[in-house]
């Protein structure tokens, strides 16, 4: 069966029907490049005016305007608010009332696209494997990133969160139109990774999405992550304004000027440093969501009532912090270089500024306890990675899970740890799952490109797709069309249950209290320490152009690893997606 032309609120669209075998039978309808909104520079997105005739939705549209890997040029375009749909079909009748999974990509709110990195037309976020294996509709889309998506003056002149509003427009478009593609508008799951996972979290917290979202999955990121909310947007807006020659004293005049500035110039006016700075790299993520009093009306911690009826899966990779550790403490990845106590203390200080000297010392002490017994470089490097993983991913995720569970009415809560080790041959032997390593498995790459993977990788991919799509169907990862290797029990506040995802998932994979000692430290010991400098997120760099963090470095700085350009290698590389 195949859909043919589908009538949407914008007009007719026609995709392509791809047969899944030479013998006919099952197939997938694929629609690429359906417009869901339009947007002017630094303005909220608006409804797309539509078209006449039948839109041929057969090619991915360009990503939203963003800096290239070298940060000295741009690619993509401003006209970028398009979405893509995969609809699995059986042999006889067209699909009807299928669960819908809407993907939000990561990339530090700075880069990325709905189709993901691409190698020889093999796109990372190709929804075909999820759709056909789980019998769900998959939707991916573009949203604005970088200054164009998140620049804010912290007031009504430039409220920011444009990229979040793009995401909302896509979700709302799906709600209104997906029935025509065979989807169930009352069963929408949003899922995402890293900045996309934090976006998923923020969308569930925003009052704008009331009634739109049934379930959510956050992979390595939360609204509570220290890198997910910008507490000092005006500083960064002024930084950009200065670079492009806009006035900075009056936010109204600054906003008016920025809106008519060449969007490419705005994009290139910000550069993310990768060489070691005074503070950890996440402090330099300037253009990220803000508490605008509207789309995000309050601090995310106060918005969990809005998730009371949204089923949630949240988890992290066991070495999510590795990518950041390699930037903040470059010796971590280098066999011939050593990590010193001083390196680690500087890193700890950078992440604990709000609590001053006491905070840094207490944190340093608990994390280095094992160093007395095992002062090996391997142990010290693993500690650096564990610390970054905890601060940036584990602790915010655990707090979010507890908040979700505590505020739940009908909602169910599930937690996981992804531990299937990275396949990067250049990584140390002790390496676990790096940031973004989970993506290839969720998107079924071991099946789509089997020669690049081992049977154990396919086992991981099969299990993840089964759990994820069962959850989208029923709200329970164990119940649905796909058999699962073991029962995944819900998260409870008492036991902190989580599923450890590895190549062999058994009943022993259900575990409890992940890194309980460290969670207690952050939630209790660290929390009660007196705050010495106000909120650590409001650290304001000096107003001059000096290189003191977190002022963005000058234009000749190095750059952080970013996703490959559209014709480069795909997901198995480290830092393919950034964070």
């Amino acid at each position: 069966a195949k859909l043919g032309a589908v009538y949407t609120e914008g007009g007719f669209v026609e995709g392509v029907n791809k047969k899944l075998s030479l013998l006919g039978g099952d197939s997938v309808d694929i629609f690429k490049g359906i417009p869901f909104a339009t947007a002017k520079t630094l303005e909220n997105p608006q409804r797309h005016p539509g078209w006449q005739g039948t839109l041929k939705a057969t090619n991915f549209k360009k990503r939203c305007l963003q800096a290239t890997i070298t940060q000295d040029n741009t690619y993509g375009q401003e006209d970028c608010l398009y979405l893509n749909i995969w609809v699995p079909q059986g042999r006889k009748q067209v699909s009807h009332n299928l669960p819908v999974m809407v993907w939000i990509y990561g990339g530090a709110f700075l880069m990325g696209s709905g189709q993901g990195a691409n190698f020889l037309k093999n796109y990372l976020y190709d929804g075909e494997e999820i759709a056909t294996r789980g019998n769900v509709i998959v939707v991916t889309f573009n949203y604005r990133v970088g200054p164009l998506g998140f620049l804010s003056t912290g007031d009504a002149n430039l409220p920011g969160n444009f990229g979040l509003r793009d995401q909302h427009m896509a979700i709302a478009w799906v709600k209104r139109n997906i029935a025509a593609f065979g989807g169930d508008p009352d069963n929408i799951t949003i899922f995402g990774e890293s900045a996309g996972a934090a976006s998923v979290s923020l969308q569930t917290l925003s009052p704008y999405n009331k009634g739109l979202i049934r379930r959510a999955i956050s992979q390595s990121g939360m609204a509570l992550s220290p890198w997910a909310i910008q507490k000092n947007p005006l500083f960064w807006a002024k930084t950009i304004a200065k670079k492009v020659g806009c006035p900075t004293e009056d936010t109204g005049k600054m906003a008016a000027c920025l809106k008519i500035t060449d969007p490419r110039a705005l994009t290139l006016a910000y550069k993310l440093p990768v060489k070691k700075q005074e503070y950890p790299v996440v402090h330099y993520l300037a253009f990220i969501p803000v508490i605008d009093g509207d789309f995000i009306p309050d601090d995310p911690i106060n918005l969990y009532n809005n998730t009371a009826d949204i089923d949630y899966i949240a988890g992290i990779n066991n070495m999510d912090g590795h990518l950041f550790a390699t930037i903040d403490v470059p010796a971590v990845d280098k066999t011939k270089q050593t990590v010193t106590e001083e390196d680690f203390y500087r890193l700890v200080s950078g992440h604990t500024v709000a609590k001053g000297l006491k905070g840094a010392q207490a944190t340093f002490d608990i994390y280095t306890e094992s160093w007395a017994q095992d002062p090996s470089q391997e142990n010290m490097k693993k500690t650096v990675v564990a610390f970054e993983t905890d601060v940036l991913f584990l602790i915010p995720t655990e707090i979010a899970l507890a908040q979700h569970k505590a505020h739940a009415k009908s909602a169910k809560t599930y937690s996981y740890l992804f531990s299937h080790p990275s396949r990067m041959p250049i990584y140390p032997k002790w390496m676990g799952a790096d940031h973004a390593d989970d993506l290839q498995y969720v998107f079924g790459k071991p099946f789509a490109t089997p020669l690049g993977y081992r049977p154990q990788d396919r086992a991981v991919s099969k299990a993840m797709i089964a759990y994820w799509t069962n959850f989208a169907r029923s709200g329970d990862p164990n119940m649905g069309n796909s058999p699962v290797p073991t029962h995944w029990y819900p998260y409870t506040l008492e036991n902190g249950n989580y599923l450890d995802i590895t190549k062999t998932i058994t009943s022993a994979s259900m575990k409890e209290h992940l890194r309980e000692k460290f969670l207690k430290f952050w939630a209790v010991t660290f929390e009660v320490l007196p705050t010495v400098t106000g909120d650590q997120d409001t650290l304001t760099p000096p107003e001059d152009d000096s290189e003191v963090a977190p002022d963005p470095p000058s234009d000749d700085s190095q750059v952080v690893p970013v996703p490959p350009t559209d014709d480069s290698v795909e997901a198995q590389m480290p830092a393919t997606i950034g964070f």
């Epitope: 043919g4 032309a5 589908v6 009538y7 949407t8 609120e9 914008g10 007009g11 007719f12 026609e14 409804r47 797309h48 005016p49 539509g50 078209w51 006449q52 005739g53 039948t54 709302a172 478009w173 709600k175 209104r176 139109n177 029935a179 025509a180 009634g211 739109l212």
Partner: antibody, heavy 119, light 105 residues
Framework: QVQLVQSGAEVKKPGASVKVSCKAS????????MHWVRQAPGQGLEWMGV????????SYAQKFQGRVTMTRDTSTSTVYMELSSLRSEDTAVYYC????????????WGQGTLVTVSS | DIQMTQSPSSLSASVGDRVTITCSAS?????LNWYQQKPGKAPKLLIY???RLPSGVPSRFSGSGSGTDFTLTISSLQPEDFATYYC????????FGQGTKLEIK
């Protein structure tokens, strides 16, 4: 100027089919979608479906699926709406209506065709 | 399908009055349109995209709203304005409100 001229009134028996035509003029026929909307006596408006005259693509309201067929003849700039298995509750005025612009409202309407279903 | 609910379903008013008709959608919609229909005639487009007037529609008609709640206002009723008014949402399955009949008091 845009004109949509519909065929005359019809009286049909239950179980029969009716085919209503709508001839367009004053614009490029293949450039705009054509919708069919009906209105039972003393009742409100009900959307039945839409056809894209350039390629013949159609979409029908769930309620009429399997009973309605919309076609077009580009040589005469005419669209047709055929409704089968008629029942008394199909007695209504049937309107063709052209999109105003983009995915916009129904900007131009035919004069309507009364279809009476009676035994 | 998205349900559209108009209120009131009928309304009596006098020439010169200011009249407001509301339309509520069962879920958030992108844009809303309003039509005027006189007995024995086809509907006529009055307002589109919630607040925009097609050429030839008098400026006494105005529309507002977004999300789920929309309003049609006639600032000063004229004799030719007595008719039935319908709201309409354009999604993949368009639907109309049940209509509001505006009668002379």
């Amino acid at each position: 100027q845009v004109q949509l001229v519909q065929s005359g009134a019809e009286v049909k028996k239950p179980g029969a089919s009716v085919k209503v035509s709508c001839k367009a003029s004053g614009y490029t026929f293949t450039s705009y979608n054509m919708h069919w909307v009906r209105q039972a006596p003393g009742q409100g408006l009900e959307w039945m479906g839409v056809i894209n005259p350039s390629d013949g693509a159609t979409s029908y309201a769930q309620k009429f699926q399997g009973r309605v067929t919309m076609t077009r003849d580009t040589s005469t700039s005419t669209v047709y709406m055929e409704l089968s298995s008629l029942r008394s509750e199909d007695t209504a005025v049937y309107y063709c209506a052209r999109d105003y612009y983009g995915s916009s409202p129904l900007g131009y309407w035919g004069q309507g065709t009364l279809v009476t279903v009676s035994s | 399908d998205i349900q559209m609910t108009q209120s009131p379903s009928s309304l009596s008013a006098s020439v010169g009055d200011r009249v407001t008709i509301t339309c509520s959608a069962s879920q958030s919609i992108s844009y809303l349109n309003w039509y005027q229909q006189k007995p024995g005639k086809a509907p006529k487009l009055l307002i589109y995209a919630a607040s925009r007037l097609p050429s030839g529609v008098p400026s006494r008609f105005s529309g507002s709203g977004s999300g789920t709640d929309f309003t049609l206002t006639i600032s000063s009723l004229q004799p030719e304005d007595f008719a039935t008014y319908y709201c309409h949402q354009r999604s993949s399955y368009p639907t109309f409100g049940q209509g509001t009949k505006l009668e002379i008091k």
